[in-house]
Amino acid sequence: TIPPHVQKSVNNDMIVTDNNGAVKFPQLCKFCDVRFSTCDNQKSCMSNCSITSICEKPQEVCVAVWRKNDENITLETVCHDPKLPYHDFILEDAASPKCIMKEKKKPGETFFMCSCSSDECNDNIIFSEEYNTSNPDLLLVIFQ
């Protein structure tokens, strides 16, 4: 058998390499598709998704979509290829280590989406950038 480090490259997007031919490890993401949520008016929420999946393609990142309409609130957690739009939107923040929610214009509902590229990063969805950037250790130093 020929190990992967000497295999000729094949036309298959299950294998992703950088410029030096290194293989990319796949992302681990929360993947519960669409579920009802109680997350509302909070700076951050946990997904409450118990399924962590190995993303099928190594280029995929973690995505979370929060939607609120007159009837309910849902949270969607998936893997997705950032080269492709999701819900008709580009994943602009796919390289971020944290899932920082950004509002998108959708008629008839409030729609937030985030994407990120660290393991299970779509488990903790953050609606406040201030919440994300504040450093508790720094505050401790300031107030001492």
Epitope: P3, P4, H5, V6, Q7, T17, D18, N20, G21, A22, V23, K24, F25, L28, I54
Partner: nanobody, 124 residues
Amino acid sequence: EVQLLESGGGLVQPGGSLRLSCAASGSTFTEYRMWWVRQAPGKGLEWVSAIEPIGHRTYYADSVKGRFTISRDNSKNTLYLQMNSLRAEDTAVYYCAKQAPNQRYVARGRLDYWGQGTLVTVSS
């Protein structure tokens, strides 16, 4: 430097079982997330399953969920893959690989990160 050596592959009938092992030489086995990766003839790599070093939390590709079980014995520096209800589409060379915390890429030439592979053939 850790070297990885897989064993346990072979020919098995559809519906049968196999247990793969991956022995790691070296003392840093417990620092790494370990993976089973497979490559079918003419196809790309498929990341089958992973297991954390501490707590032994496990992850599976949808294609093997409910059929394959990954485990590790840190005292023996060994990774395992129990494969049940095998199908023809599970035919591949199976590799073990290791991933350090926050590591996103692994060089294909790094023999200390990849095993040489063991061939699993599922056929009647």
